[in-house]
């Protein structure tokens, strides 16, 4: 429905608080280097303008699109060219090209300082002194570091962030109350950002059809009692929401997400029996809860899939009449019966079915041709099952840290050209699949593990896209969204790689390592391990283990020494020499 003033429409729908927060997120996700104060100023100007349009929708400029209004505002930033270089050229373009230009310049790995958490008392003072500024700063800092963060969900995180400070700054032991909550928000936030990044990559790199297929599969698993028509409606609406958020249309996205949550709750009887609790919550919690809701029970007595999709004489007729609808039905019917499969596996099965029909419906005897199509599914199902079984056994044997190290070695040998920080970050995240998923029973392992790995490998893909260095990574990332994980799994050692020259500086450590947290110390050691493999890609597991054990002993010894720095200097030289000898460097 058309509104005279889009900005007034969204301001009224969302309310001033959410409007301001979403505009701040949008601006911070576009101009990631701009100071906080500059963004706040821009947001206030936009908000004042929106209020004039609410008062009179016919007022000057109120009929302009949000992209025009926001783009014009961003292009008033004085230091645009100095700070962002060629992004300033976007401002010479007209909408919609200008917005597309801004989107293309979003940086997944912006050159921003790591967020250092101040002392609890300092944070509580800042919170009490100016709660509004404190919370805006949170939105700004997360949004600029995660330019694809799902904006309405970030509002939910901010609400929890505020609740944590409200509660804990009054507690007897503020730190004991607050720090675990902040750690949880940080970890959940990183996971949420990565999941949303995959949705945006799916839409932007593989198109709406790919996203809709993913959504049909996931929603059919989650709502197996819902009719295909209901799932189709939810998929259409969900696709609109994510297309908007991924396209920077955050006000529309948040508004449409609220409408979708409302619809789901009003129609929960025909969607899922698991929604009752979610639907009693306030809006932000409700939307989050629905997004995370457990799978409903499967309907009783579902018939064999073969009846509709193999044995029926009308398979080719049904396929020819409406290909995507028929494939959607196949995916819906398969997914609702298989909550034990990963979404990507279900999509591989649907792709195999589609390929078979394309071939067989043109054959002399179509039924004879596609009669055995379900047999082709068996190896596709067994491959992830076997891989998860092997890796969970390895994880249980090694524990998380050493399992991460095994993956670091594995992936560095596959794609040694990738930067060390990226290999460390991605392999550490890949390794977390163990503690996240291996504890689950068989029926939940695959959807947990393989869909999580899709999210992590997408991180590798988006980081690599910024600075491409490996044809193998590009190939696995771009050929097929659903086959990314099997593509990376199938990579062997890169025999074309010329080992990196040895640089003693890379393996020089100082006393500052002793004051690092356990996690930071692990990252230092894992960085050294990647560098070691880059120098000696043919090193055996045993050789690498021996060097890493010596390295751990060296760090432990020197951190206990009276003169730590001297110990690191002298023992470090010995360690480097011994390692070179052990590895034949």
């Amino acid at each position: 429905d058309a509104h005279k003033s889009e900005v007034a429409h969204r301001f009224k729908d969302l309310g001033e608080e959410n409007f301001k927060a979403l505009v701040l997120i949008a601006f911070a996700q576009y101009l990631q280097q701009c100071p906080f104060e500059d963004h706040v100023k821009l947001v206030n100007e936009v908000t004042e303008f929106a209020k004039t349009c609410v008062a009179d929708e016919s007022a000057e400029n109120c009929d302009k699109s949000l992209h025009t209004l926001f783009g014009d505002k961003l292009c008033t930033v004085a230091t645009l060219r100095e700070t962002y270089g060629e992004m300033a050229d976007c401002c010479a373009k007209q909408e919609p090209e200008r917005n597309e230009c801004f989107l293309q310049h979003k940086d997944d790995n912006p050159n921003l300082p790591r967020l250092v958490r101040p002392e609890v008392d300092v944070m509580c003072t800042a919170f009490h002194d100016n709660e509004e500024t404190f919370l805006k700063k949170y939105l700004y800092e997360i949004a600029r570091r995660h330019p694809y963060f799902y904006a309405p969900e970030l509002l939910f995180f901010a609400k929890r962030y505020k609740a944590a400070f409200t509660e804990c700054c009054q507690a007897a032991d503020k730190a004991a109350c607050l720090l675990p909550k902040l750690d949880e928000l940080r970890d959940e936030g990183k996971a949420s950002s990565a999941k949303q990044r995959l949705k945006c990559a799916s839409l932007q790199k593989f198109g709406e059809r790919a996203f809709k297929a993913w959504a049909v599969a996931r929603l059919s698993q989650r709502f197996p009692k819902a009719e295909f028509a209901e799932v189709s409606k939810l998929v259409t609406d969900l696709t609109k929401v994510h297309t908007e958020c991924c396209h920077g249309d955050l006000l529309e996205c948040a508004d449409d997400r609220a409408d979708l949550a409302k619809y789901i709750c009003e129609n929960q009887d025909s969607i899922s029996s698991k929604l009752k609790e979610c639907c009693e919550k306030p809006l932000l919690e409700k939307s989050h809860c629905i997004a995370e809701v457990e799978n409903d029970e499967m309907p009783a007595d579902l018939p064999s899939l073969a009846a509709d999709f193999v044995e029926s004489k009308d398979v080719c007729k049904n396929y020819a009449e409406a290909k995507d609808v028929f494939l959607g039905m196949f995916l819906y019917e398969y997914a609702r019966r298989h909550p034990d499969y990963s979404v990507v596996l279900l999509l591989r099965l649907a792709k195999t079915y589609e390929t078979t029909l394309e071939k067989c419906c043109a054959a002399a005897d179509p039924h004879e041709c596609y009669a055995k199509v379900f047999d082709e599914f068996k190896p596709l199902v067994e491959e992830p099952q076997n891989l998860i079984k092997q890796n969970c056994e390895l994880f249980e044997q090694l524990g998380e840290y050493k399992f991460q190290n095994a993956l670091l070695v594995r992936y560095t040998k596959k794609v040694p050209q990738v930067s060390t920080p990226t290999l460390v970050e991605v392999s550490r995240n890949l390794g977390k699949v163990g503690s996240k998923c291996c504890k689950h029973p068989e029926a939940k392992r695959m959807p947990c593990a393989e869909d999580y790995l899709s999210v992590v490998l997408n991180q590798l893909c988006v980081l690599h896209e910024k600075t491409p260095v490996s044809d193998r990574v590009t190939k696995c990332c771009t050929e097929s969204l659903v086959n990314r994980r099997p593509c990376f799994s199938a990579l062997e050692v890169d025999e074309t790689y010329v080992p990196k020259e040895f640089n003693a500086e890379t393996f020089t450590f100082h006393a500052d390592i002793c004051t690092l947290s356990e996690k930071e110390r692990q990252i230092k050691k894992q960085t050294a391990l990647v560098e070691l493999v880059k120098h000696k890609p043919k090193a055996t597991k045993e050789q690498l283990k021996a060097v890493m054990d010596d390295f751990a002993a060296f760090v432990e010894k020197c951190c206990k020494a009276d003169d730590k720095e001297t110990c690191f200097a002298e023992e470090g030289k010995k360690l480097v020499a011994a390692s070179q000898a052990a590895l034949g460097l």
Epitope: A229, L302, P303, A306, D308, N318, F326, M329
Partner: nanobody, 118 residues
Amino acid sequence: EVQLQESGGGLVEPGGSLRLSCVASGFTFQHYAMSWVRQAPGKGLEWVSSISLVGGGTSYADSVKGRFTMSRDNAKNTLYLQLNSLKSEDTAMYYCVRGWHPDVPRPLGQGTLVTVSS
């Protein structure tokens, strides 16, 4: 507006046959599994059978298994129920409804009455 128009009922002797039809309108017929339910005089609704979206997969209540056959024609937006070897206990008002094994009340058409009596 969703409309389901049942027809084909009537008076039949035990052992006889009938074919019920249900014409659907106001929604995308092929996007829904469909079911037949019935209500005997003075009794509650009883599920009879369901059919999948495409029509290949069916499910039947034990009381009608082997005697009733459900089918659909998506091109005609029509649902069918072939009733064979009818018994007096099959006497009921028959309704077609949207959904597989509908366990929540759904909008019913006016139904079609089947009376099995000698």
